[in-house]
């Protein structure tokens, strides 16, 4: 069924997304979107003068906020306001429904059931994905964030779909395809989960996806002056050639046993290895 906008809502300047609504297009205002914005603030006889425009700024009127329910249109009277109700509604604020199921008030395939009490002539039982007294509102099912692990939610109307990130699967992306479960990192490496792909943090001296490749910390020849580098599990170790000292064999030792430096770094003795 087509949406029933508020009675009197300007067809040129207003529109509605749910029954009884009258939302204005840009440049128009008023309860029925009949007042141009550019002149509305200057036409009102009420209200204080605006310091910026010199126009009278409208004060709150009895129709502001639209007290008329169910699409009723509000008009100001000398004392208060008056609601003009659409067909099927009555009362001071059009709050009483005269609509019956025969009028087909339930939108989006909602099932209409006759109301049990006088104030409710009918009740709409909405299909999945819709809500509101007339099933006029689409439920944003993605707002519940049903997709896990950063999956993208798609509401297809008839169903929800989750578009999963790489490394995840399942209706709600709940399955981690490539985690550390059942995975072994060799040579003392530890498994690290991240981004849906398992990764091994390898022990010193090992590399590769599963730490099966031996990495040689001595490959860069860090020990100077012919010193020997050893790939010890605690870190690389330099054994200096005679006549040199330091963690990387960088300091010459004079024949009298003194370093070539003005003062040898503390803790370093001739032939000292790296700690």
């Amino acid at each position: 069924a087509p949406l029933v906008c508020r009675a009197g809502c300007s067809p040129e300047h207003g529109f509605c997304e749910q029954p009884g609504e009258c939302r204005c297009l840009e440049g128009w205002t008023g309860p029925l979107c009949t007042v141009p914005v550019s002149t509305s603030s200057c036409l009102s006889p009420r209200g204080p003068s605006s310091a910026t425009t010199g126009c009278l700024v409208p004060g709150p009127g009895p129709c502001d906020g639209n007290p008329c329910a169910n699409g009723g249109s509000c008009s100001e009277t000398p004392r208060s306001f008056e609601c003009t109700c659409p067909r099927g509604f009555y009362g001071l604020r059009c709050e009483v429904s005269g609509v019956t199921c025969a009028d087909g008030p339930c939108f989006n395939g909602g099932l209409c059931v006759g109301g049990a009490d006088p104030d409710s002539a009918y009740i709409c039982h909405c299909p999945p994905g819709f809500q509101g007294s007339n099933c006029e509102k689409r439920v944003d099912r993605c707002s519940l964030q049903p997709c896990r692990n950063g999956g993208l939610c798609l509401d297809l109307g008839h169903a929800l779909r989750c578009r999963c990130r790489a490394g995840f699967a399942g209706p709600r992306c709940e399955h981690d395809l490539d985690d550390c479960a059942g995975r072994a990192c060799a040579n003392g490496g530890t498994c690290v989960e991240g981004g849906g792909a398992h990764r091994c943090s390898c022990a010193l001296g090992f590399g590769g996806r599963d730490c099966r490749e031996r990495a040689d910390p001595c490959a860069a020849r860090p020990c100077a002056h012919g010193g020997r580098c050893y790939a010890h599990f605690s870190g690389l170790v330099c054994a200096c050639a005679p006549g040199y000292m330091g963690a990387r064999c960088e300091f010459p030792v004079h024949p009298d046993g003194a370093s070539a430096l003005p003062a040898a770094p503390p803790g370093l003795r001739p032939g000292d290895p790296q700690r």
């Epitope: 001296g205 031996r214 580098c229 050893y230 790939a231 170790v237 054994a239 005679p242 001739p270 290895p273």
Partner: antibody
Amino acid sequence: QEQLVESGGGLVQPEGSLTLTCTASGFSFSSSYDMCWVRQAPGKGPEWIACIYTGDGSTDYASWAKGRFTVSKASSTTVTLQMTSLAVADTATYFCARNSGYGYFGLWGPGTLVTVSS
Amino acid sequence: QVLTQTPSPVSAAVGGTVTISCQSTESVYGSDWLSWYQQKPGQPPKVLIYQASNLEIGVPSRFKGSGSGTQFTLTISGAQCDDAATYYCQGYYSGYIYAFGGGTEVVVK
């Protein structure tokens, strides 16, 4: 599982020659180690013979071993020890051992027995 | 480079303390590149301590190494029957030279 296995031991006559082989598994000599030979005569303590540094192929020998013993790298997983002019006093179990730093042997083979006898 | 171990043999009761000394004729490389090994018949030596005082992975904490330069000690606190073996010290010296001590036999009663 890193392992070393020696082979080539056996009975040899005095003044004879023998080549022992050390085969590594679970690692290769592409990393930098001292691959060494140590021997142990029956009822005696271990005695260092020689090492080859896999980083650059340089070799070091105990003073008594120079000239008669030669250590070399045959492949990325094998090291050999060539022994010449063998004497009865060279009878021992010969071990292959690896120094991975701080000058100690953290990995040993089970040893191979060399008997020099006429 | 000569390493001298004392005493040998040494006897201890189960739960007792064993102390083995190792003296070098010259300072080991870096003053602490000395290691200790345990050897049982028919097996290769097994490293216990490296760099004078560092316990090798998997070795019980009752084994303790100390010392520097030319004088080193291995202490076994709370000796077990399984500790009955021959113990060797081994030094590494400047110029890429290795040397072993003569060994100390430990008997646990």
